[in-house]
């Protein structure tokens, strides 16, 4: 397997192990550290068929697979209550807001023709308001809400026709919003799109058990990302001067027996099969990890030499997601019989070693609470403190180049296969209320303090 990631488990002396005195580090983050918070369009916008928006694969999936959920129409209604979101952002004092554009809100059937005016107006108003507040927008082009028409007509991401259609959509976004957006994310966590959308069927479009489809979808997502990066790099970066990446998500894993080379090998294989699947072509040598190519010979598509060259280096920073979606449920194929772990610091070290110490944006991090928990989310604070401490140690002790952190999420909202049974917001929203007031939870107050102090003070 490529890279030096496996040194993490063998506790290479170059890696500072966490000893007792370092279990918590009282220190500040680097000056100008980029503090932010994020949402996904489908999770918070609501208004799934309002003002000319087209249906997405998730709108369809909710109605066909999640029988106890009426629709995302309730949600947090960010489409209607934009001002309330902005007030919540003001309250916390973030440097950036990471949100996604709903592709079918702009182009109801996915094809770039004349954009839906109300959708365009919504995102334009949001961007203007962020710029006015000195809040940097980080915009995700695709957070899983593929226009349903593209699924029905082409079979969605299984069909490489989608690559060019996605590039057209991206081009439009660069043209319309690029003057106000300096950070772009093409796709949010493609692993989950492929694995749960086409493997387990737990995510839209809900297809099951076809490993060939899983890896075809992954292949097309990588190629779509690469095409958009080259497009931005050639046609938009020269004058817009922005950065573009793809958010890659992963779990972390520890060997059953820390000195056992077999178990360490399995841990490496586990990380490679999830994170490496997408990171290797983009941040590595342009191809799939060797072990995957060998084992998955009958289902993993092949990159030509020209394609490898095209894929390689198509990210301006490493956008990393580390949260519950990559842990629950974790596919047994990825676990390799080893022990999953929430050690974000070690995951960051693995990325550093495996991909030559890239600049890292933590593009999603946080945990969840039960839906019955309202504003006293002590577990969320505990988890946030733990994760932020690990990030700080990674920066200060391991010299990992983390430049920003995205707390997830700004608001309670629709949580994919968990629907409304869990909450991930720093702001509480009563989904049954008319006004959908955003009430800051304890975690919002805590994060606000962290940002104000730029870390942990004694």
């Amino acid at each position: 397997f490529s890279g030096d990631g496996r040194a993490i488990w063998s506790k290479n002396p170059n890696f500072t192990p966490v000893n007792e005195s370092q279990l918590f580090l009282y220190d500040t983050f680097p000056k100008n550290f980029f503090w932010g918070i994020g949402t996904g369009a489908l999770q918070v916008e609501g208004s799934w068929k309002k003002d000319g928006k087209g249906p997405s694969i998730w709108d369809h999936f909710i109605h066909t697979h999640l029988k106890n959920v009426s629709s995302t129409n309730g949600s947090s209604d960010s489409y209607i209550f934009l001002e309330k979101d902005l007030s919540a952002l003001d309250f916390i004092g973030v440097s950036f807001y990471q949100f996604s554009i709903s592709w079918p809100r702009l182009f109801p059937d996915g094809i770039v023709t004349v954009a839906n005016a109300k959708g365009l107006q919504y995102y334009s108003t949001l961007l203007d308001a962020l710029v006015l507040r000195n809040i940097e927008p980080i915009v995700t082009l695709y957070h899983w809400d593929l226009p349903l028409a593209l699924q029905e007509k082409y079979g969605g991401w299984k069909n490489d026709t989608i690559i060019d259609i996605f590039n057209d959509y991206a081009t439009y976004c660069f043209q319309m919003f690029g003057d106000r957006v300096k950070y772009w994310i093409t796709i949010h966590n493609p692993y989950l799109v492929a694995w749960h959308g086409y493997g387990t069927g737990m995510h839209a479009p809900g297809e099951k058990g076809n490993l060939a489809a899983v890896y075809t979808v992954g292949h097309n997502l990588i190629k779509a990302h690469s095409k958009v990066w080259h497009n931005y790099n050639t046609h938009f970066r020269p004058h817009q001067k922005g950065w573009l990446s793809i958010t890659l998500g992963s779990h972390w894993i520890e060997p059953n027996r820390s000195e056992n080379t077999m178990d360490i090998f399995k841990c490496q294989q586990s990380m490679v099969s999830v994170l490496g699947w997408f990171a290797n072509p983009i941040h590595g040598d342009g191809d799939y990890p060797e072990g995957m190519r060998k084992k998955l010979f009958s289902v993993l598509p092949i990159f030509s030499e020209a394609e490898k060259h095209e894929m390689r280096g198509t990210a301006d920073f490493f956008a990393f997601s580390f949260g519950p979606n990559n842990f629950k449920p974790l596919n047994t194929m990825a676990k390799m019989g080893q022990n999953v772990s929430l050690n974000l610091r070690e995951a960051l070290n693995w990325i550093k070693l495996e991909y030559n110490n890239p600049r890292i944006l933590i593009a999603e991090n946080g945990w969840f609470t039960d839906s019955r928990v309202k504003t006293e989310d002590t577990t969320a604070i505990y988890m946030m403190k733990n994760f932020l401490s690990q990030v700080l140690q990674a920066i200060r002790l391991d010299e990992i180049r983390v430049f920003g952190y995205t707390a997830w999420s700004l608001l309670d909202g629709f949580e994919w296969q968990d629907a409304y049974t869990i909450r991930r917001g720093l702001f509480y929203v009563d989904f049954n209320s008319k006004q959908k007031e955003r009430k800051p939870k304890s975690s919002a107050h805590y994060y606000k303090q962290i940002i104000r102090e730029n870390g942990f003070s004694l």
Partner: antibody, heavy 119, light 107 residues
Amino acid sequence: QVQLVQSGAEVKKPGASVKVSCKASGYTFTSYDINWVRQATGQGLEWMGWMNPHSGNTGYAQKFQGRVTMTRNTSINTAYMELSSLRSEDTAVYYCAKYNWNYGAFDFWGQGTMVTVSS
Amino acid sequence: DIQMAQSPSSLSASVGDRVTITCQASQDISIYLNWYQLKPGKAPKLLIYDVSNLETGVPSRFSGGGSGTDFTFTISSLQPEDIATYYCQQYDNLPLTFGPGTKVDIK
């Protein structure tokens, strides 16, 4: 528990075809490739090819290209391997094997089907 | 195609003896090597995958090692039920290929 049960022994004349079946149970049939491996009398194991039961996609070793066809019937969780234009050197035990993606190995095998080609 | 050679082609040893079989690939196959046990009239059985990983339920007296082109398979203490033919198999490249086998019996 995982089981692969193959059809019984066959005797065929040169030039004829043989179709061996392999019924899977104890796991999701469409989730793992079925591979076919043979062992001629007194010889080693020889890989013939793979078949993905979900898609029906196949890949054959060059040596068998044009003579072998691997198919499946997902409604009865059964894979088939048909070998045509039989010759005496095709006399062998034919095994089906479940391919484990994690291992890159055949983790379960059928009991084998003896195919005798004789005039 | 990658050729796999095994030695010895057969061996006899006493119960309790340590038995070692070697497998050599015609080119570098990294760690993409598995070992199988084949008993007459029985389904073949996977013992070791990726050079040294023991398949679940396989006794710990079986072990494997090596990388690149040279590999070993060891039975630390031969048991009567270990009488069988053992095959190495590479999956570094298609077609998948097996070694010619090593027949192990009891003295």
